[in-house]
Interface confidence: low
C-alpha cells in the first residue's frame, strides 16, 4: 500500500553477509515496514 509514516532502517545482511548488505531503505507504508524491516536493532 501507499502512504503511511516513513521508516528509515538499515536492511542488514541476513546470513553470513550474503544478502542485502547494509542497504538503507525508506519504507513507505506500514505494510512494507512489516514486510522488509528485518532487524529492529538496525533501526535508525
Amino acid at each position: 500500500g501507499g502512504g503511511g509514516s516513513k521508516h528509515k532502517c538499515v536492511q542488514n545482511s541476513l546470513v553470513n553477509n550474503e544478502t542485502l548488505e547494509s542497504i538503507m531503505n525508506t519504507l513507505e507504508s506500514e505494510e512494507d515496514f512489516r514486510k522488509y524491516f528485518y532487524y529492529l536493532e538496525g533501526s535508525k
Epitope: 542485502l20 514486510k35 532487524y39
Partner: antibody, heavy 114, light 113 residues
Framework: QVQLVQSGAEVKKPGASVKVSCKAS????????VSWVRQAPGQGLEWMGW????????NYAQKLQGRVTMTTDTSTSTAYMELTSLRSDDTAVYYC???????WGQGTLVTVSS | DIQMTQSPDSLAVSLGERATINCKSS????????????LAWYQQKPGQPPKLLIY???TRESGVPDRFSGSGSGTDFTLTISSLQAEDVAVYYC?????????FGQGTKVEIK
C-alpha cells in the same frame, strides 16, 4: 500503485546477447532492490539474481555468473538485466520483481533459436 | 544452496474442499534473532507472473482472500486453501529468501476434481 513494466519479446541467435528492461513506478525506486527470475517453457521459477537500486550492489546466481549483468538507472527508475552468450536453454520468460517478489513485472519472452 | 521441495507435485480437489500443499527446506529458514521464517508462497496462473500470497511463512499479503493461510516454521511449511474456488486453479510455489540464491520449490499444480 506499484507497477513494473518490462520491455517486449525478443528473438535472439545462439551466442548473442539480450538486455531486458523493467521500469518501476508507484514507489521510491531507490528504496528497494530488484530481483530477476526466469521461467523456461512449462518449467518452474529460477532466481537469477538481485540488484540494490540504492547502491547498485548485486548478487548473482552462481550458474549465471559471468554471463549476467544487472544494472539500474535511477534517473528513469529502470532496472536492466543483460544476458550474454545466449544458448537455446536460455529460452524463457524473464521476470523482474521488487526485492524478493512482492510485485512482479508482466514478463519478457526471450527466444533463443538459430 | 537451500533446496526447496514441495509435495505433492499436483492435486485435484473438489470445489469447496480443503487443499494442502507442503514445502520442505533443506535447512532452516528461521532467523533466531527476529524469530521470522524467510518463506513466501506464490500463486501463478497460466500466462501471468507469480502473485505473492504469503510472506514470513504466515502473513497474508493485502488483498489476498482469507481462505489462503500459511503455517510452519524452520524447515516444514504448509499452504492451505480452506475452501477451494474455481479461480484458485493455478500452480503454487514456495520460496525461501533467507539466503542467496533465493530458491523456489518446483511448484504444485492445483486442479478441480
Amino acid at each position: 500503485q506499484v507497477q513494473l513494466v518490462q520491455s517486449g519479446a525478443e528473438v535472439k541467435k545462439p551466442g548473442a546477447s539480450v538486455k531486458v528492461s523493467c521500469k518501476a513506478s508507484g514507489y521510491t525506486f531507490t528504496s528497494y532492490g530488484v530481483s530477476w527470475v526466469r521461467q523456461a517453457p512449462g518449467q518452474g521459477l529460477e532466481w537469477m539474481g538481485w540488484i540494490s537500486a540504492y547502491n547498485g550492489n548485486t548478487n548473482y546466481a552462481q550458474k549465471l555468473q559471468g554471463r549476467v549483468t544487472m544494472t539500474t538507472d535511477t534517473s528513469t527508475s529502470t532496472a536492466y538485466m543483460e544476458l550474454t552468450s545466449l544458448r537455446s536453454d536460455d529460452t524463457a520468460v524473464y521476470y523482474c520483481a521488487r526485492n524478493w517478489g512482492d510485485y512482479w513485472g508482466q514478463g519478457t519472452l526471450v527466444t533463443v533459436s538459430s | 544452496d537451500i533446496q526447496m521441495t514441495q509435495s505433492p507435485d499436483s492435486l485435484a480437489v473438489s470445489l469447496g474442499e480443503r487443499a494442502t500443499i507442503n514445502c520442505k527446506s533443506s535447512q532452516s529458514v528461521l532467523y533466531s534473532s527476529n524469530n521470522k521464517n524467510y518463506l513466501a508462497w506464490y500463486q501463478q496462473k497460466p500466462g501471468q507472473p507469480p502473485k505473492l500470497l504469503i510472506y514470513w511463512a504466515s502473513t497474508r499479503e493485502s488483498g489476498v482472500p482469507d481462505r489462503f493461510s500459511g503455517s510452519g516454521s524452520g524447515t516444514d511449511f504448509t499452504l492451505t486453501i480452506s475452501s477451494l474456488q474455481a479461480e484458485d486453479v493455478a500452480v503454487y510455489y514456495c520460496q525461501q529468501y533467507y539466503s542467496t540464491p533465493w530458491t523456489f520449490g518446483q511448484g504444485t499444480k492445483v486442479e478441480i476434481k
